[in-house]
Interface confidence: medium
């Protein structure tokens, strides 16, 4: 008789999840000399240990501590780029501006980017059929707790001027319920971080409004100011030009506002 399996609302573990994590780890440590010492098999074992045989709605940050320890990495604390709802552009930016880092440019972020995973209570199986959805099932699921943990640590490490890329096409440009709004904003350290600079990315050619005046941006400014961190905001009217000008700042079209 087939054993009853919990049916969750979210998609199941990404196929070939163990192989993907291991392969990404090997690739990352080959590309980044400062992480060459990392033993990828140990990383996978620690990753697996965080969720295997555990109820996928009872995962804690403590479950991920062995993985966090193995993935400890020093990035320049004044070169951190946070993002909310605009991951693709943030990643294109750091591909060009190589001295800046998103969370997904770190080992742990790179390992888990775009992947889903969960296990089952009291079995060593990975659940490829379904995993808990953050809204419909539970928030303390393996994926959500992982990103909350690494995001908190990433924000805590930041210093000087921290940049955040926000999607100006969204109805809530700053969303208090996003990872940035609920975790990263509250874990920037006022004694280390001087300024949070928001880059609001415009979604279309006609949009010449000053989105830095948006009520949700004002809300972000208020939250940041209360934490004794300065706030500044820039409109990025033409993201394509923005990327181009990062690549080739001497271009004739890069003198005007982008």
């Amino acid at each position: 008789v087939p054993r009853w399996r919990q049916q969750w609302s979210g998609p199941g573990t990404t196929k070939r999840f163990p192989e993907t994590v291991l392969a990404r780890c090997v690739k990352y440590t080959e590309i980044h000399p400062e992480m060459r010492h990392v033993d990828c098999q140990s990383v996978w074992d620690a990753f697996k240990g965080a969720f295997i045989s555990k109820h996928p709605c009872n995962i804690t940050e403590e479950d991920y501590q062995p993985l966090m320890k193995l993935g400890t990495q020093t990035v320049p604390c004044n070169k951190i780029l946070l993002w909310s709802r605009i991951k693709d552009l943030a990643h294109q930016f750091t591909q060009v501006q190589r001295d800046m880092f998103t969370l997904e440019d770190t080992l742990l972020g790179y390992l888990a980017d775009d992947l889903t995973w969960c296990g089952e209570f009291n079995t060593s199986k990975i659940n490829y059929q379904s995993c808990p959805d953050w809204r419909k099932d539970c928030s303390n699921n393996p994926v959500s707790v992982f990103w909350k943990t690494v995001s908190r640590r990433f924000a805590e490490a930041a210093c000087d001027v921290v940049h955040v890329m926000l999607n100006g096409s969204r109805s809530k440009i700053f969303d208090k319920n996003s990872t940035f709004g609920s975790v990263e904003v509250h874990n920037l350290q006022p004694e280390k971080v001087q300024t949070l600079e928001a880059w609001v990315i415009h979604g279309g050619r006609e949009d010449s409004r000053d989105l830095c005046q948006d009520p949700t941006i004002k809300e972000l400014e208020s939250i940041i100011s209360k934490r004794n961190i300065q706030f500044s905001c820039k409109n990025i009217y033409r993201p394509d030009k923005f990327l181009q000008c990062v690549k080739n700042p001497e271009d004739s079209s890069c003198t005007s506002e982008i």
Epitope: D88, V96, G204, R205, D207, D240, L243, N248, S252
Partner: antibody
């Protein structure tokens, strides 16, 4: 599944009109600038027109300016191209494609054929 | 006459590396990002390279680069399924229009 489906093509006489439609599925239509690109038989790709996310900005190739009008209905997830005063040289497969200003035209429809002939 | 200039044809044998060039001006290629599209026979174009990056699902055999007013698409480890038409495209600030290259027909011998 992310896809764009064009319709409205057909055979029309010179000087006639056609209205092309492009229905969007599987992505947030209102987040994307939209485009029409055409390809005459045996020829390369030619941009026809673009429209911004809210529809307040439109752009046209010189070859269709004053004859073609691009529009969109974000509530219906649909893009349109009204083509008036059609000429033989407008004969082509017409594709709609979405566009994000930092990611190119990444989703294309299958195309709809417009033939202008007497 | 296309605003962006591409060679009409290119060819190579399986496993070879082939490069397709795209020449423009400061108002298009130099000042803007370049896209490359692949059009397999009888199908719609497909985004192949954007901002020298590959969308997910595009093999890493394809790469794009740009220098000044020229861009190029490189295909390494050529395969028979790469036989297609390839187009470069960029926004042109002067024309306020998208401009495409005339297309390059790639033949795998």
């Amino acid at each position: 599944e992310v896809q764009l489906l064009e319709s409205g093509g057909g055979l029309v006489q010179p000087g006639g009109s056609l209205r092309l439609s492009c229905a969007a599925f599987g992505f947030t239509f209102s987040d994307y600038e939209m485009n029409w690109v055409r390809q005459a038989p045996g020829k390369g790709l030619e941009w026809v027109s673009s429209i911004s996310i809210t529809g307040s900005w439109t752009g046209y190739a010189d070859s269709v300016k004053g004859r073609f009008t691009i529009s969109r209905d974000n509530s219906k997830n649909t893009l349109y191209l009204q083509m008036n005063n059609l000429r033989a040289e407008d004969t082509a497969v017409y594709y709609c494609a979405n566009y994000k200003s930092y990611y190119g035209m990444d989703v294309w429809g299958q195309g709809t054929t417009v033939t202008v002939s007497s | 006459q296309s605003v962006l200039t591409q060679p009409p044809s290119a060819s190579g044998t399986p496993g070879q590396r082939v490069t397709i060039s795209c020449s423009g001006s400061s108002s298009n290629i130099r000042n803007n990002l370049v896209n490359w599209y692949q059009q397999l026979p009888g199908t719609a174009p497909k985004l192949l390279i954007y901002n020298a990056q590959r969308p997910s699902g595009v093999p890493d055999r394809f790469s794009g680069s740009k220098s000044g007013t020229s861009a190029s698409l490189a295909i390494s480890g050529l395969q028979s399924e790469d036989e297609a038409d390839y187009y470069c495209a960029a926004w042109d600030d002067s024309l306020n229009a998208w401009v495409f290259g005339g297309g390059t027909k790639l033949t795998v011998l």
